[in-house]
């Protein structure tokens, strides 16, 4: 297993609809044709897997069925979107990238993107 640098933004604010997008960029040492991307959430010293996807270079990402994530790839960049977020989902979202094929296997883990989610205030009742 060889190390690889992964960069991602430090902070992202989710939209009022609970959607957050960020770019995960990796410094590919070789010419990988198959890549696996995993998004991990770290909160209160607990790490959980949010979603995982694989792709062949030049293609869209293929996520697990019923995933809350979508994404596209362009060169060594992966554009990730997480949907259905609520205030309780605020936390550090870490991008993990694995170059699966051809060998050698490379692994890179980003420093994480702090995603802030603010639940929208309900609209006040109107007398009109």
């Amino acid at each position: 297993c060889k190390a690889m640098h992964v960069a991602q933004p430090a902070v992202v604010l989710a939209s009022s609809r609970g959607i957050a997008s960020f770019v995960c960029e990796y410094a590919s040492p070789g010419k990988a044709t198959e890549v696996r991307v995993t998004v991990l959430r770290q909160a209160d010293s607990q790490v959980t897997e949010v979603c995982a996807a694989t792709y062949m270079m030049g293609n869209e990402l293929t996520f697990l069925d019923d995933s809350i994530c979508t994404g596209t790839s362009s060169g060594n960049q992966v554009n990730l979107t997480i949907q259905g977020l609520r205030a309780m989902d605020t936390g550090l979202y870490i991008c993990k990238v694995e170059l699966m094929y051809p060998p050698p296997y490379y692994l890179g883990i980003g420093n994480g993107t702090q995603i802030y989610v603010i639940d929208p205030e309900p609209c006040p009742d109107s007398d009109f």
């Epitope: 995982a52 694989t54 062949m56 293609n59 869209e60 293929t62 697990l64 699966m100």
Partner: nanobody
Framework: QVQLVESGGGLVQAGGSLRLSCAAS????????MGWYRQAPGKQRDLVAS???????NYADSVKGRFTISRDNAKNTVILQMNSLVPEDTAVYYC?????????WGQGTQVTIST
């Protein structure tokens, strides 16, 4: 577990055409990518073409304009139509299945282009 069954390899003269087929079966997710790699003697396995469930395709530069990859999602089958073949296309062609949870190789089919 995913099984891949390939067919369609063989010997053809330069300038000719061949059609490779690969059928996937087993525990398949709703979305996955299928593709073709090839490996010439003494060389590494290189990606030739790939296609996603939605029909997004990608080709190696060396085959663009000559090879076409297509897919029948109802039958979980991928087709590689190879035209204007040249001796450099001689290799073992391997079908590839890739999803978020599973990866599989076909057994390989020999393609030989004679001059």
């Amino acid at each position: 577990q995913v099984q891949l069954v390939e067919s369609g390899g063989g010997l053809v003269q330069a300038g000719g055409s061949l059609r490779l087929s690969c059928a996937a079966s087993g525990r398949l997710s709703r979305t996955f990518t299928m593709g073709w790699y090839r490996q010439a003697p003494g060389k590494q396995r290189d990606l030739v073409a790939s296609i996603t469930t939605s029909g997004s395709t990608n080709y190696a530069d060396s085959v663009k304009g000559r090879f076409t990859i297509s897919r029948d999602n109802a039958k979980n089958t991928v087709i590689l139509q190879m035209n204007s073949l040249v001796p450099e296309d001689t290799a073992v062609y391997y079908c590839r299945f890739l999803s978020a949870s599973t990866a599989a190789w076909g057994q390989g089919t020999q393609v030989t282009i004679s001059t």
